[in-house]
Every structure is written in structure tokens, then in C-alpha cells.
């Protein structure tokens, strides 16, 4: 069964900067990745970035840099100052659309006890939805 993992990390150098990393553990080819904050895309969350293998990358402030890390994983840097910076308990979600598996989404947030710059290894997060 395909899985999606999500890792959220606060950067040690910039305390208002977050890095979100997501990956897809499946054999299909990825046609679209959507990153949202506040909850799953379309069910609480608002879109922060859309990554398409051919069309490129679409991102919304405060997303600073969305990029493909590998063919099946992406990263997104979020920056902000004051009100625009995400709070520690903000949920970030990644939705991978792949063929033939369909859409798979998982969410994560900053670990409650994490020090800046430290985070748990990217283990698969609970799968919230599979279309």
C-alpha cells in the first residue's frame, strides 16, 4: 500500500522559518503534489504550493522555496515575521496524486518538544485520505 510521509522542522538559524518535507512511498508516477497548511487540502487547509512534474511549481507566500528533492519527494521552506509566521502547532499536509494509485494525503506538524533545527526522522505519517 502506498504511504505518504511528512516532516516539519523549524530552522535553527531563523526561528520564523520552517521546512516541510514530504515523500511518497509507492511505485506509481507522481502527477501532482499539493502542500497546504491548516489541514488537508480542501478540508480545512489552504493551498501553499503545487508542484507539477511538467508545469513547474506554483507557490504562495509565505512559502519561499518549493522544490523537488527526488522524483518522489519535495521540500518547502516557509518564512515569516510576526503574524505571517506559522505557529508551532500549525498542521501541514501533503497530497500526492499518482498513477495508478490515485491520491494519497498525510499531515504533520512540528513535534511539540522539538528544539530548533532538530526533528524526528521522516517516518510515514498517518494516511488521512486515499481517493
Amino acid at each position: 500500500t502506498p504511504e505518504v510521509w511528512v516532516q516539519v522542522r523549524m530552522e535553527a538559524t531563523e526561528l520564523s522559518s520552517f521546512t516541510i518535507r514530504c515523500g511518497f512511498l509507492g511505485s506509481g508516477s507522481i502527477s501532482l503534489v499539493t502542500v497546504s497548511w491548516g489541514g488537508p487540502n480542501g478540508a480545512g487547509g489552504t493551498t501553499l504550493a503545487v508542484l507539477h512534474p511538467e508545469r513547474g511549481i506554483r507557490q504562495w507566500a509565505p512559502a519561499r522555496q518549493a522544490r523537488w528533492e527526488t522524483q518522489s519527494s519535495i521540500s518547502l521552506i516557509l518564512e515569516g515575521s510576526g503574524a505571517s509566521s506559522p505557529c508551532a502547532n500549525t498542521t501541514f499536509c501533503c497530497k500526492f496524486a499518482s498513477f495508478p494509485e490515485g491520491s494519497w494525503e498525510a499531515c504533520g506538524s512540528l513535534p511539540p518538544s522539538s528544539d530548533p533545527g532538530l526533528s524526528a526522522p521522516p517516518t510515514p505519517a498517518p494516511i488521512l485520505r486515499a481517493d
Epitope: G42, G44, T46, T47, R58, A61, G80, C87
Partner: antibody
Framework: QVQLVQSGAEVKKPGASVKVSCKAS????????INWVRQAPGQGLEWIGY????????GYAQKFQGRVTMTADTSTSTVYMELSSLRSEDTAVYYC?????????????WGQGTLVTVSS | DIQMTQSPSSLSASVGDRVTITCRVS??????LAWYQQKPGKAPKLLVY???NLAEGVPSRFSGSGSGTDYTLTISSLQPEDFGTYYC?????????FGQGTKLEIK
């Protein structure tokens, strides 16, 4: 019906701050982003930033970063845009506008606008 | 940032005329474009989203077309109430930018 009602006109001195409000009704407040756009006299439209009321998360145009703060009060379905260190070139009509949080493909409803005049 | 170039900057046309306004974008935005109409002293009104979709309540004489970097708003038969300034706007991520506007006057 969907409505965005903004606060009244403001006159401010250079260096001061202004806080404009936008009260939403007729839809689920936390389901949409609210953008702020301004228009200087006789000029075109300029995007300032947006806020997602559900989590209070916001994103601003680089030009306004550090000078603008957007907040949301979910209990009254009201969004606020505060602009500090005002200068004469900030004289403009400020609009709030609703945007679908998922599709993010248009601003479908707009407030009536708030004229902010910065003058010594 | 993505640049939007609208043309013409102004035009004068007669009732019943077919009017075309174009918007050229500095990079491919894959139809993530909206068109607005603004009348003096009023807020902009959404006409078209995703380049070709007519917003609710907008008369069918308005239509949008285009893809890639070139987009067009067409008014098939100009009506007296169509005067105003028209703006295009991209939604290919932030910062959102607008065209400089096309002022449409009725002859």
C-alpha cells in the same frame, strides 16, 4: 448573500499607522482566504497580501513585508489589515477580497473599499 | 515576479461593437488568470476566472480565451453599461500581479 463590508475612510499623518477592517457575511468565514489590494488615485491595482482566517496564517508581498500585519477575528468574522510607517505614497483605496482557499483562482467578492489619505 | 502587459491601455468603441482586450504574461501561467471590470469609484468585479470560465451573473457577451502567456477578453456586442476599466490578474502563486488596465469608453 456574500458581503464584505469595510470600515470608513481614514486620514493619517506620515509615520502613523492605520487599521482597516473587513467584516464578512453570507458564507463560512474560515473557508476562504481574504486578500488585500490597494489602488492609488488614478492608478492600477496592487496586491498587498492575504490571510487565511482558519489558522490566522498570512502571506505578504515583499514590498509590504515588515510594514503590514493582517489578523482575523473568527468570533466576528472580521479581518484587519494594519499598515505602519505610513508615507504619502500609501494614499489609496484599500480593498479586501475573498479567494477560494483551495483553488486559489480568483477574487470573487470584494469589499466597497476604504480610502486612506496620508497627509501632513 | 510575473509581469502582466495589457493592451490597449485605452479604447473607444460604439454600442454593438466587438471589443478585444489582450493580456500578455511574462511566463506560462497555465490559464491561472482572471479578468475584472471596474467602474469609477467602485470595487472591481470578477468577470472571468481560469482564463475561460464566466463568473456567476456575468452576461454571456463576455468571454475569455487563451493559454500559455497570451490571454484575451472579448465583449461580443458592446453595451452602454460596459464602460469602465478592465484588469487581468494572474493566480500562478504570489505575488499576484495585475495588468495596468484597459480603459474602455463608449463612443
Amino acid at each position: 448573500q456574500v458581503q464584505l463590508v469595510q470600515s470608513g475612510a481614514e486620514v493619517k499623518k506620515p509615520g502613523a499607522s492605520v487599521k482597516v477592517s473587513c467584516k464578512a457575511s453570507g458564507y463560512t468565514f474560515t473557508d476562504y482566504n481574504i486578500n488585500w489590494v490597494r489602488q492609488a488615485p488614478g492608478q492600477g491595482l496592487e496586491w498587498i497580501g492575504y490571510i487565511y482566517p482558519y489558522i490566522g496564517g498570512s502571506g505578504y508581498a515583499q514590498k509590504f513585508q515588515g510594514r503590514v500585519t493582517m489578523t482575523a477575528d473568527t468570533s466576528t468574522s472580521t479581518v484587519y489589515m494594519e499598515l505602519s510607517s505610513l508615507r504619502s505614497e500609501d494614499t489609496a483605496v484599500y480593498y479586501c477580497a475573498r479567494e477560494d482557499k483551495t483553488a486559489r483562482n480568483a477574487m470573487d467578492y470584494w469589499g466597497q473599499g476604504t480610502l486612506v489619505t496620508v497627509s501632513s | 515576479d510575473i509581469q502582466m502587459t495589457q493592451s490597449p491601455s485605452s479604447l473607444s468603441a460604439s454600442v454593438g461593437d466587438r471589443v478585444t482586450i489582450t493580456c500578455r504574461v511574462s511566463e506560462n501561467i497555465y490559464s491561472n488568470l482572471a479578468w475584472y471590470q471596474q467602474k469609477p469609484g467602485k470595487a472591481p468585479k470578477l468577470l472571468v476566472y481560469e482564463a475561460t470560465n464566466l463568473a456567476e451573473g456575468v452576461p454571456s457577451r463576455f468571454s475569455g480565451s487563451g493559454s500559455g502567456t497570451d490571454y484575451t477578453l472579448t465583449i461580443s456586442s458592446l453595451q452602454p453599461e460596459d464602460f469602465g476599466t478592465y484588469y487581468c490578474q494572474h493566480f500562478w502563486g504570489t505575488p499576484y500581479t495585475f495588468g495596468q488596465g484597459t480603459k474602455l469608453e463608449i463612443k
